[in-house]
């Protein structure tokens, strides 16, 4: 079960980074990307 939770969490992280990249293309990128810990 813990492997599944880790996989889901990592998948969501990957999606979040992808979304961040797309939003940065619209909004303009300034600093290094970061993702908040939940």
């Amino acid at each position: 079960h813990s492997d599944g939770i880790f996989t889901d969490s990592y998948s969501r992280y990957r999606k979040q980074m992808a979304v961040k990249k797309y939003l940065a293309a619209v909004l303009g990128k300034r600093y290094k990307q970061r993702v908040k810990n939940k």
């Epitope: 939003l23 940065a24 293309a25 619209v26 303009g28 990128k29």
Partner: antibody
Framework: VEESGGRLVTPGTPLTLTCTVS????????MSWVRQAPGKGLEWIGI?????ITYYASWAKGRFTISKTSTTVDLKMTSLTTEDTATYFC??????????????WGPGTLVTVSS | AIKMTQTPSSVSAAVGGTVTINCQAS??????LAWYQQKPGQPPNLLIY???DLASGVPSRFSGSGDGTQFTLTISAVQCEDAATYYC??????????????FGGGTEVVVK
């Protein structure tokens, strides 16, 4: 950031609002349009990205068009109805991981659609 | 398209009390959420961005939390000048439609 062009128009009349900016380059910031009907909440219309690509709320597609020059961001509105009566705001967006001081709102311009 | 549901629509608080406003997104928006304060006749003023980052010049009694679809704005030690309408704004990215944004319906805060 200051909006202009709002006025009283009759239904069906097209209208273009202009957002004039100074002190920064539109090449570096995305700009959005937001509206607020009298006594109602805020409604996102659309955004002009730094990549010059525009995105719109689903209800605004086809009737609203955002364009820009070197110092202005325009909102062209067609087929206006009384439901479009609102104060229209132009806003400068925060850049990715940017400073909150990036976020600027104009004072708004009032559009009244009435017969 | 993204939809933001904000509750309650109105709340009353005593000076020194605490106010909690909730915002729910129709889809996972990660931390792409901002909170605004608006007073009559004025444009909105940014309070919180990226779900929990305090905007410059905003008193520390304002705080934001949340991630995904559930977000909260908390006003601690409420002051008279906090009487206003508060809005959340979410931003999403769709592979179909690209950039999308929406505001919550607003929460009127009345200070007694």
């Amino acid at each position: 950031v200051e909006e202009s062009g709002g006025r009283l128009v009759t239904p069906g009349t097209p209208l273009t609002l202009t957002c004039t900016v100074s002190g920064f380059s539109l090449n570096n910031y995305a700009m959005s349009w937001v509206r607020q009907a009298p006594g109602k909440g805020l409604e996102w219309i659309g955004i002009m990205g730094v990549n010059d690509i525009t995105y719109y709320a689903s209800w605004a597609k086809g009737r609203f068009t955002i364009s820009k020059t070197s110092t202005t961001v325009d909102l062209k509105m067609t087929s206006l109805t009384t439901e479009d009566t609102a104060t229209y705001f132009c806003t400068r967006e925060i850049r990715d991981d940017g400073d909150s001081s990036d976020k600027l709102w104009g004072p708004g311009t009032l559009v009244t659609v009435s017969s | 398209a993204i939809k933001m549901t904000q509750t309650p629509s109105s709340v009353s608080a005593a000076v020194g009390g605490t106010v909690t406003i909730n915002c729910q997104a129709s889809e996972d928006i990660y931390t792409n959420l901002a909170w605004y304060q608006q007073k009559p006749g004025q444009p909105p003023n940014l309070l919180i961005y990226d779900a929990s980052d305090l905007a410059s010049g905003v008193p520390s009694r304002f705080s934001g939390s949340g991630d995904g679809t559930q977000f909260t704005l908390t006003i601690s030690a409420v002051q008279c000048e906090d009487a206003a309408t508060y809005y959340c704004q979410g931003v999403a990215w769709s592979s179909n439609t690209g950039y999308g944004s929406a505001f919550g319906g607003g929460t009127e805060v009345v200070v007694k």
